[in-house]
Interface confidence: medium
Amino acid sequence: QRFAQAQQQLPLESLGWDVAELQLNHTGPQQDPRLYWQGGPALGRSFLHGPELDKGQLRIHRDGIYMVHIQVTLAICSSTTASRHHPTTLAVGICSPASRSISLLRLSFHQGCTIASQRLTPLARGDTLCTNLTGTLLPSRNTDETFFGVQWVRP
Amino acid sequence: QRFAQAQQQLPLESLGWDVAELQLNHTGPQQDPRLYWQGGPALGRSFLHGPELDKGQLRIHRDGIYMVHIQVTLAICSSTTASRHHPTTLAVGICSPASRSISLLRLSFHQGCTIASQRLTPLARGDTLCTNLTGTLLPSRNTDETFFGVQWVRP
Amino acid sequence: QRFAQAQQQLPLESLGWDVAELQLNHTGPQQDPRLYWQGGPALGRSFLHGPELDKGQLRIHRDGIYMVHIQVTLAICSSTTASRHHPTTLAVGICSPASRSISLLRLSFHQGCTIASQRLTPLARGDTLCTNLTGTLLPSRNTDETFFGVQWVRP
């Protein structure tokens, strides 16, 4: 493929470098299965370039196809604990606006203490992503064990 | 979003296509938990475009936010073996320069024989990434079972 | 890095935004271990921009380095089921043309009911990717549990 021929040029701004990597802040109160996230250079290696946090949930600012990835490690966990407290499940989804609510990614822990996955999905400006952890086990807040991020890939 | 309006154009070179995918070469001597990697077309499907290998460890050549990913499969492993030899842990981190030393990604095998994960993280020119496998089990050298890579995502 | 200096400009078309995210359609007949995929906006959140489906298998249209990712969840599965039906293995590979046939990514389920991984790999126009699930357990067709995708990363 030749790179210098086509007339239509790509301005830097429109590349839509939207990207975010978040670390766990805290879990929700009793009946709220959501994980609450935080990001920013003062916190370590987390950041938001484009997307924003809205009460600990990630809000998208640019339409496009995104790579969404997550890793969650359970705290004070062994394979015995994990299986005894089964089912512990992590789901990532669009939780608002309600009209676009959908589960994007779901994993159960079974006999493991960590889940990690990623997927491509279309997201629209204003979509808020929620990560729901159901079960009685708590997630680790270590920044190398539990994190959640998105990367804009194409329009 | 319109793509042809903005004045600022993006030269190809500055896109920073830095990317690498490595295959396992060997494990370290007795007291060295590091995995030693290799890459290049002669070896199969591994490659380095930008980053370099320094004594089997991956060194970054361009500042930016990177997607780091890894999969490690234990050799001579069953779920019984994995749990009997627990804890076997894999950690990816910046190991040099010492001033920037930090763990980026950590996973335990528990009752499984494979771990796989990925994350976004800022890396700087000169950062060297090390992958430490602690425990008594050995990793598989099969190129479809054990691999480690980075992809430059944005400045 | 300065972005506006270099003379060589990057046309939008040549960025090669090739990307696909697929959902499971069905498994193959008795002796065929392949998973058959489907994609398109009418089906939900799956899509193909560049690559195409050929009898349920993904065919690449643009040379380059791709990020390949997959998640497969077994249906009607518990850690007991998974270990009793072991080995259940998922392999992603180039299955045609035959001259380029190779396994790219392989994972066993052991005591878990989900595998998820990703890797960077060079692919060429005409390469067809197959995903082989060996074992007696069936995959879930839920779109948030089982999916397969590729993303063009660089030439």
Partner: nanobody
């Protein structure tokens, strides 16, 4: 159901010989690489030897090279390990296993129950 069943273990004097067999069922034996792995009392697993599907390529750990011979009979779905010049340090439970690939240290996805080999005078 995929199964591997070892036999041929037992007590043997140093310098003696034994032949281990492994009967495979439930999969296409001839298309799979196979291997032998052992576990000495109180020790971890140690790879011993492996062989590709056709039987043309064989691999051995340094500790057994020249003394052990791996072979297979695809018509009988059976894997063998001929062990000569046995030493006390060869005492272990020997497992037959189906391999993921041909590398000496590649993963195993099916294991037998193991057969005990004791080398003692």
């Amino acid at each position: 159901e995929v199964q591997l069943l070892e036999s041929g273990g037992g007590l043997v004097q140093p310098g003696g010989s034994l032949r281990l067999s492994c009967a495979a069922s439930g999969f296409t034996f001839s298309s799979e690489a196979m291997g032998w792995v052992r576990q000495a009392p109180g020790k971890g697993l140690e790879w011993v030897s492996s062989i590709n599907g056709s039987g043309r390529n064989t691999y051995y750990a340094d500790s057994v090279k020249g003394r052990f011979t791996i072979s297979r009979d695809n018509s009988k779905n059976t894997l063998y390990l001929q062990m000569n010049s046995l030493r006390a340090e060869d005492t272990a439970v020997y497992y037959c296993a189906r391999k993921h690939g041909e590398y000496y240290d590649s993963g195993y996805d099916v294991w037998g129950q193991g057969t005990l080999v004791t080398v003692s005078s």
